[in-house]
Interface confidence: medium
């Protein structure tokens, strides 16, 4: 097993607005959970836009997942990440 | 389940600040989402704030984000709420309370502490 | 604010009958995932509450199965089969759909 790194960037988007993604890389198996979170709950699927999990050249997979959310509210979102049994959460940066 | 141990209580002037505390044991504190609550004599509750371990992050009532602070200390599982500028108004029970999102995928204030009754007085 | 309106404020009881708790929200609590995270607790007196069911009519663990939660939308119900002694106190319902999250006033339920 290789635990995904996880990073988790922001960008702008419409006005008041920003778009945070959450990529997970270099894990092995290829199976993960990877959702974004508003007060701790998992925000529904079409709240969220996905990538695929692909293969990255070094035999391990990487995906990513997004969500775009109100600027000033970032503290309420977190990224939750479950792989082979470990789990963290990762918040979006200042 | 765990245990949360809240401080003892509390007897202060208006116009002061009390720091509640709310030690941890038994789970992962990290992983956890604590948040506060307060509960006049004989009145409903009125949910304050939550933080999440794990990174310090917050989300507060409005009508509390003047009068609390929420803080954690992972070093000592032990989650903390400050209340300033105390007026008769702040005279409450006050609770911490741990969020369930993983047992039960998401139950709110699952396991709660003993309370802490603070009371503002000149 | 959503606001959480319990009826009746109390509800005297025989033990071993059945009781209804109705609970109504100002506006609809579904969260935007899709759920509703509406909740019941129980205060009993000098004690701190008590999680009984979640997400509508989900038990908690060890509550007892006469406990039960229904309701969609803007209306919801508590129902205990058949009342027992430490089933007395205050039961407050609570939406955690919507910030802030917000309590119910509370019913009292007590021996008749």
């Known amino acids: 097993t290789v635990p995904p790194m996880v990073n988790v960037t922001r960008s702008e988007a419409s006005e008041g607005n920003i778009t945070v993604t959450c990529r997970a890389s270099s894990f092995y198996p290829r199976n993960i959970i990877l959702t974004w979170r508003q007060d701790g709950v998992s925000l529904s699927h079409d709240a969220q836009q996905w990538g695929d999990v692909l293969p990255d050249g070094n035999g391990t997979y990487q995906t990513w997942v997004a969500t775009r959310i109100c600027r000033g509210e970032e503290q309420r979102f977190t990224c939750y990440m479950e792989h082979s049994g470990n789990h963290s959460t990762h918040p979006v940066p200042s | 389940q765990g245990q949360m141990q809240q401080s003892g209580a509390e007897l202060v002037k208006p116009g002061a600040s009390v720091k509640l505390s709310c030690k941890t044991s038994?789970?992962?504190?990290?992983?956890?989402?604590i948040s506060w609550l307060k509960q006049k004599p004989g009145q409903s509750l009125e949910w304050i704030a939550w933080i999440y371990a794990g990174t310090g992050g917050t989300s507060y009532n409005q009508k509390f984000t003047a009068k609390a602070q929420l803080t954690v200390d992972t070093s000592s599982s032990t989650a903390y709420m400050q209340f300033s500028s105390l007026t008769t108004e702040d005279s409450a029970i006050y609770y911490c309370?741990?969020?369930?999102?993983?047992?039960?995928?998401?139950?709110?204030?699952?396991?709660w502490g003993q309370g802490t009754l603070v009371t503002v007085s000149a | 604010d959503v606001l959480m309106t319990q009826t009746p404020l109390s509800l005297p009881v025989s033990l071993g009958d059945q009781a209804s708790l109705s609970c109504r929200s100002s506006q609809n609590i579904v969260h935007i995932n899709g759920n509703t995270y509406l909740e019941w607790y129980l205060q009993k007196p000098g004690q701190s509450p008590k999680l009984l069911i979640y997400?509508?009519?989900n038990r908690f663990s060890g509550v007892p199965d006469r406990f039960s939660g229904s309701g969609s939308g803007t209306d919801f119900t508590l129902k205990i089969s058949r009342v027992e002694a430490e089933d007395l106190g205050v039961y407050y319902c609570?939406?955690?759909?919507?910030?802030?999250?917000?309590f119910g006033g509370g019913t009292k339920v007590e021996i008749k």
């Open positions: 309370a741990r969020h369930d999102y993983y047992g039960t995928s998401g139950a709110w204030f699952a396991y």
């Open positions: 609570f939406q955690g759909s919507h910030v802030p999250w917000t």
């Open positions: 997400k509508v009519s």
């Open positions: 038994g789970f992962t504190f990290s992983d956890n989402y």
